[in-house]
């Protein structure tokens, strides 16, 4: 039997989303203008390509990566696109208001679009923990709160700790992971009888999730290098990320086989573990002085990811109600922490190697940054979770979790489409 979109949400969603879009258009009209300078066109194209890579990662990579549910694949891809589109608009405005606004108007450049896409990516990472359990109206709230929280976190870190764009954006991994996990913790957890099959993965959606993983794998070097200030740092970041993700693929596939009693390879492990190296080197990708270090980090990250995928889902499912295939949240939380630890270790080595003093102070600052990112993620995530539980959003009933038919019109309704 087909399940119609609840009448109340049908009234609430278009009104809420279109009102918000109208408000964004007005804000853009009054407060923004394009960078008027005449740049070298070839340079602009090269700069745009980085932004394009990030958009591909977000729309195709993360969109398809989260589409492995048997009966929630359409919603995963389309809702991701919806959140990306909304998130980028709000992030451009927010970043402009926080950094440029005293001068009058927000100047939009290719860089601001790049930055906004990366901010929106945070939501797409977080939402993996709650997709299937929320409707679009709730996702709009999640986008607004998370992008705002991340923007403010980045501004606070920049002002207090004096870090550059790359460093304060690379907290995105732990921020997004802990934000998503704390939102999931607030949502109703138990899956009622008879709906367990919906959060299982199916072959074709799993293939599309693998496609998403491949896109992310290909473009991760662009993500890790996008905000670095000089070509030499970008080159180092690209190389180190590439080596790390290459090794994490090998580790993911072989580790997955090793973890299975019959030596079978798990699709779910591979989906997430292929990206492990990219997350783990993110913070320090420009600082790693030689390829073998990046490769070792990729190996460790791959093993952690496979180990996590094997042992953590049970715990996450019980405590947070996160399905077995939605492992991005805890994966990124572990790997993001690993990346931050590696950064601190490199900082110490660099400080000692250069004969500098104040090692303890520098380490303390880095730990302070990380702690602040986690605290703000948890607090804003809990706030979002509480907001999403409000009755006004007409959240899908637990019996309708992970069900495309709640949201989509299908020409012929069949189970397992």
């Amino acid at each position: 039997m087909s399940s119609k979109y609840p009448r109340s949400v049908r009234r609430c969603l278009p009104l809420w989303a279109l009102t918000l879009e109208a408000a964004l258009i007005l804000l853009f009209y009054f407060f923004t203008h394009y960078d008027a300078s005449l740049e070298d066109q070839k340079g602009l194209v090269a700069s745009y390509q980085v932004g394009q890579d990030l958009t591909v990662m977000a729309a195709i990579g993360l969109g398809f990566l989260t589409s492995s549910f048997r009966r929630h694949s359409w919603s995963s891809v389309a809702f991701n696109l919806f959140m990306l589109a909304l998130g980028v608009q709000w992030a451009i405005l927010l970043d402009g208001f926080l950094s440029q606004f005293p001068s009058g108007k927000v100047v939009i450049t290719l860089f601001s679009i790049r930055l906004a896409t990366m901010s929106a990516l945070s939501v797409l990472i977080s939402v993996d923990a709650v997709l299937g359990k929320v409707n679009l109206a709730q996702l709009v709230v999640m986008v607004l709160v998370e992008v705002t929280a991340l923007g403010n976190l980045r501004m606070v870190i920049s002002n207090i700790f004096n870090t550059d764009y790359h460093m304060n954006m690379m907290h995105i991994y732990v921020f997004a992971a802990y934000f998503g996990l704390s939102v999931a913790w607030c949502l109703p957890k138990p899956l009622p009888e008879g709906t367990e099959d919906k959060d299982q993965t199916a072959t074709i959606p799993s293939l599309s999730a693998m496609l998403g993983a491949l896109f992310l794998w290909m473009f991760w070097p662009s993500f890790n290098s996008a905000l670095l200030r000089s070509p030499i740092e970008r080159k180092n970041a690209v190389f180190n990320t590439y080596y790390a993700v290459a090794v994490s693929v090998v580790t993911a596939i072989s580790g997955s086989s090793l973890a299975h009693p019959q030596g079978k390879i798990s699709k779910t492990y591979v989906h997430s573990a292929v990206l492990a190296g990219g997350v783990a080197v993110g913070t320090s990708c420009h600082l790693i002085p030689s390829p073998w270090l990046a490769m070792v980090l990729g190996l460790v990250a791959g093993l952690i990811s496979v180990g996590g995928a094997k042992y953590l889902p049970g715990c996450c499912n019980r405590v947070l109600g996160i399905p077995h295939s939605s492992i991005m949240g805890y994966n990124f939380s572990l790997l993001g922490l690993l990346g931050e630890i590696i950064y601190i270790v490199l900082l110490v080595l660099d400080t000692v190697g250069a004969g500098n003093g104040m090692i303890g102070f520098q380490v303390l600052l880095s730990i302070g940054e990380l702690s602040l990112a986690i605290v703000i993620a948890l607090m804003s995530g809990l706030l979002t979770g509480l907001l999403l539980n409000l009755k006004i959003w007409k959240a899908p009933h637990e019996a309708k979790y992970f069900d495309d038919q709640v949201f989509w019109k299908f020409p012929h309704l069949a189970v397992g489409f």
Partner: antibody
């Protein structure tokens, strides 16, 4: 090869008018470096004005010139520009362009410094 | 981060040891550079990353410090060292210079 920067476009201009400074680079790969404009009012210290990333994708300005000055670059012509609108008397200064270089220190950490400077061009805003 | 240099001027003789300090209003780690400027000329980079000597700069110049307090030292002042010295931070936007220290002949 000698690494050089040469500013041009300075002159005397009335308040409220516009001026465009240019900085021609030679002897190095211009497209690989961030570039700054720094000014020095008569008898005063150095004041940073604007900065653009190596690819022109990101720009920064000191608060006093935001909305009036625009920094840009043409990597195909190895040239940096500073478009100055609504000029004020307190914009009178010698304007220098400077190259920002990543300087390796320790194992792998890069720090940034202005290692090549032009001789400067004088901008006088007076009625 | 605002930079405060001290002293604003000093008189010294050839062969003297000269120390100039620069204090940042917030932690800038080691992102501090020192420049020398002679009248009518462009500034010249002396020290980057708080303590690294730029190539071609005599070893009598040295820098130290981290966080908020930095020092430029000229171990034995030479006639060509009489100039104005500026500290500059590259940690975060807006990049800022100290107000300068003029080293004059006693």
């Amino acid at each position: 090869e000698v690494q050089l920067l040469e500013e041009s476009g300075g002159g005397v201009v009335q308040p409220g008018r516009s001026l465009r400074l240019a900085c021609a680079a030679s002897g190095f790969s211009f497209r690989s470096y961030g570039m700054h404009w720094v000014r020095q009012a008569p008898g005063r210290g150095l004041e940073w004005v604007a900065f653009t990333w190596f690819d022109g994708s990101n720009k920064y300005y000191v608060d006093s010139v935001k909305g009036r000055f625009t920094i840009s670059r043409d990597n195909s012509k190895n040239t940096l520009y500073l478009e100055m609108n609504s000029l004020r008397v307190d914009d009178t200064a010698v304007y220098y362009c400077a190259r920002e270089a990543p300087m390796l220190r320790g194992i792998s950490r890069y720090y940034y410094a202005m290692d090549v400077w032009g001789p400067g061009t004088t901008v006088t805003v007076s009625s | 981060a605002e930079l405060t240099q001290s002293p604003s001027s000093l008189s010294a003789s050839v062969g003297d040891r000269v120390t100039i300090t620069c204090r940042a209003s917030q932690n800038i780690r080691r992102s501090l550079n020192w420049y020398q400027q002679k009248p009518g000329k462009a500034p010249k980079l002396l020290i980057y990353a708080a303590s690294s000597l730029q190539s071609g700069v005599p070893s009598r110049f040295s820098g130290s410090g981290s966080g908020t307090d930095f020092t430029l030292t000229i171990s034995s002042l030479q006639p060509e060292d009489f100039a104005t010295y500026y500290c500059q931070q590259s940690s975060n936007t807006p990049w800022t210079f100290g107000q300068g220290t003029k080293v004059e002949i006693k």
